[in-house]
Every structure is written in C-alpha cells, then in structure tokens.
Amino acid sequence: AMHVAQPAVVLASSRGIASFVCEYASPGKATEVRVTVLRQADSQVTEVCAATYMMGNELTFLDDSICTGTSSGNQVNLTIQGLRAMDTGLYICKVELMYPPPYYLGIGNGTQIYVIDPEPCPDSD
Amino acid sequence: AMHVAQPAVVLASSRGIASFVCEYASPGKATEVRVTVLRQADSQVTEVCAATYMMGNELTFLDDSICTGTSSGNQVNLTIQGLRAMDTGLYICKVELMYPPPYYLGIGNGTQIYVIDPEPCPDSD
C-alpha cells in the first residue's frame, strides 16, 4: 500500500476543533486524489467525511460536512469541527490516487483525537 | 523493581483536574508507603507532589500541594488539580515501601495527561 503519515495524537481545542496533516508518498503524478477520514471506535469503523480534489486545487467537502481542508503537494491539512467528548477516538486518513491509472490506496495508522467538553459558562444575570 | 501499574492516557477535565489510579504489587506487608508523582517533559523529570502514608490511613499531601489522593489496599487514587495546557506531559507514579525493611521501589510507565485550556467565557454586560 501507499505510505500515508499522520500524527499519533491530537487534542481538540475547547471549541471542539481538531486539525492534523495527512501526508502521502505518491508513486507517480496523480491529478485526482480522494481523501477520506474514518473514525475507529470499539472495532467499528465509520466514515466521517471525504473529498475528491484535483492536484493544485482546493479540497471540497460537502456543505454539511464537519471537515474542511487544504492541500499542498502531497500534504492535506484536515480540520474536523463540532467535536464532543463522545467523539474521542482514532481518526484514520485514507488516500486514494484516482487518476490517471493505476489506482493507488494508502491508509494511515490513525490519529487519536482527544476531546474534552467545556464547562458551561455561568448564566449572565 | 516492584511492579507499578497506571493508565497510559488521561484527559484533564476542562477545569484542569486529572485523576488516575496507581496500583502496585507489594512483595510483602508494608506498613509505610511513599507515593511520588513525577512529571517528565523534554527528558526533564520534576517532582509534582509526594505523600507518605501508613497502610489503612489516608494519604496526606502538603497543604499547598496540587495533589490529593486516597488509598485502598495496594491502590492509590491520585488527583492533580490546577492543570493548564502547558502542564501536558507524562506523569510517573513512583512507589516506595519504606517500612518495615527491606526497602522496595517501583516506577510506573507513566500516564500521559493531556490538558486543554478552556475558552474564556464572554463578559456578562
């Protein structure tokens, strides 16, 4: 499989935002790349978000996606927002080189994202 | 060394409080036990707090200590408070059986405590 590197641990901010870089070693000159973020918890794997982009262009996630991102060469800067403590888990970066053929697939080892829910602010009287 | 077990990772609450259990396998019937919490960051090790207790009695940390704790058999429940993001690091539990002789020492593998500073609450007008 294609090598994909991502940090082992990331802390979400108190606003529930976590950012990390997903870097892949491209065997060739791909023009179309697909990036998927998967969450693994209790041996269950679910898709968090996905985006396909043309090299040199911006990543475009769906409008209702909790992810945003930018790309630079073989690096993708991913940001996941709206995280709560219950979303703590292992977030795996999956990279696919879609075009031109041949197809290449790489899976990172995962980034453990820790999320702490903030204390509610006191009511203002 | 004597076996000492502690969790690999703990998240501090948004109030900067982290709790974890430090458990040791005593070779004999110690009556006086000393527990020390050490913080390792950038290969520097500093003492966070320490308490000596008689088996069956409560742990007593110094009045100005950031630690509190309770003991039950060979388990010590430790709580560290007042933590800030800059306090993120590896917290090592050191257990010494002080009395009766002989002296036994055990060092845990450390608990990585992650601390996230909360966002300030908006001023109430």
């Epitope: - | 060394a1 396998a25 004999g28 090790v45 010494e96 002989p102 002296y103 036994y104 020492l105």
Partner: antibody, heavy 115, light 107 residues
C-alpha cells in the same frame, strides 16, 4: 533478631560445582526478595542473582557474569535460599553473601576455586 | 545495563572533617540508590536507602542526597570508626550494580 547464615563454601576445582545455602530467621522470609552478592579478593561488591517471592511468581534475575552457570532457588517452608554454582572458574573465588533485598546480610561464606 | 561511576576511589580526611562521596548513574534511576559501609572482615552494612533515607541504627552523621543521575553520601563529621569502604548501588532494576567503592582513611 534478624539472622542470615550462609553455608556450603570451601575449596573446589575449576569446572566443578558447589551449592551454597542461606538459612534465614527473625523476619518474614516469604515476604522478601532474596539475593546473592560476592566480593572477590581485592575487588568490590558484585551482585549475582535475585529470586523474588510468590506474589512475583518466584522470578529470577542474574548478572551477566554468572547467567547460565549459577541458579538461585528458595524454599519458603525452610526459610532458605540457595545458589547452585556449576562450571566454576578461578575468578569465582570470593566471599559469598546472601541478603534480604540488601537490608539484611549474612556473615558470608568463602568459596575458593583452585586446582 | 545501568553503569555506576563512584568517586573518589580513595580519600583521606581528618577526624571532624565533612566528607562527601559521589555516585553518578548512566541513566535516571529515580532515587533508587542505596549506600553501604563495608569494614574489613565484616558484612556490608546498609546506611542509606532510596537515596535519602537513613537506615535503622545508623548514625545521623550519615546523610544521602541527590536525584536523577547524581547522588551523594555525606559524613558530616568524620569519626575514627568510619574508616571503611563505601559503595553505592542501583536498586531500581536488574542488574543491581554496585559502584566500584571508595576507601576512606583517617589522616
């Protein structure tokens, strides 16, 4: 009163075997890890072997200089620890001490390996 | 393995002098260090355990300090009966290596 009494030392030829014994009294033997330490003539102290107790599954540890030649064992019912020494070399000559986790020490027994 | 570097190898001091012996370890041993006194023809005697704790029955002239990789044995006021060889030892983990010893004499 705590007492550790070693026995079994003496003169042995190179390549030979010897078994040292250590009888303990005055403390709860089964609660302790037991060790053997030696001092060669004109040399410093050298830790040789350790045997832990039942809560630690009687794990054994050895220094590199004796591993594979010496075997430490214990009998909690007899409050005793032993050191079986095989393939002895002239450099194994010295006074052998048993110690309860370095707090209590015996008087030592002299082992001489010579032809 | 943890290496123990003890210094000096020998020293001569006068009665009443303050004497210090040092032990440096090759890695952090978290205070897992003992000090012993050995007189000719006698068994080693535990002086200090856990780097800083005075063993039962040992004179308060003896004290231990240090942490991490650097440890010190201090005799606050040397007495004639303190003539002996002193050893440090790693008690954190196997092998439980001793220092090479410091032979202490009276001037």
């Amino acid at each position: 009163e705590v007492q550790l009494v070693e026995s079994g030392g003496g003169l042995v030829q190179p390549g030979g075997s010897m078994r040292l014994s250590c009888a303990a009294s005055g403390f709860t033997f089964s609660d302790n890890w037991m060790n053997w330490v030696r001092q060669a003539p004109g040399k410093g102290l050298e830790w040789l072997a350790q045997i832990r107790n039942k809560p630690y599954n009687y794990e054994t540890y050895y220094s590199a200089s004796v591993k594979g030649r010496f075997t430490i064992s214990r009998d909690d019912s007899k409050n005793s620890v032993y050191l079986q020494m095989n393939s002895l070399k002239t450099e194994d000559t010295g006074v052998y001490y048993c110690t309860a986790q370095f707090a209590y020490w015996g008087q030592g027994t002299l082992v001489t390996v010579s032809s | 393995d943890i290496q123990m570097t003890q210094s000096p190898s020998s020293l001569s001091a006068s009665v009443g002098d303050r004497v210090t012996i040092t032990c440096r370890t090759s890695e952090n041993i978290y205070g897992g260090l003992n000090w012993y006194q050995r007189k000719p023809g006698k068994s080693p005697k535990l002086l200090i355990y856990g780097a800083t704790n005075l063993a039962s029955g040992v004179s308060s002239r003896f004290s231990g300090s240090g942490s991490g990789t650097d440890y010190t044995l201090t005799i606050s006021s040397l007495q004639p009966e303190d003539v002996a060889t002193y050893y440090c030892q790693n008690v954190l983990r196997s092998p439980f290596t001793f220092g090479s010893g410091t032979k202490l004499e009276i001037k």
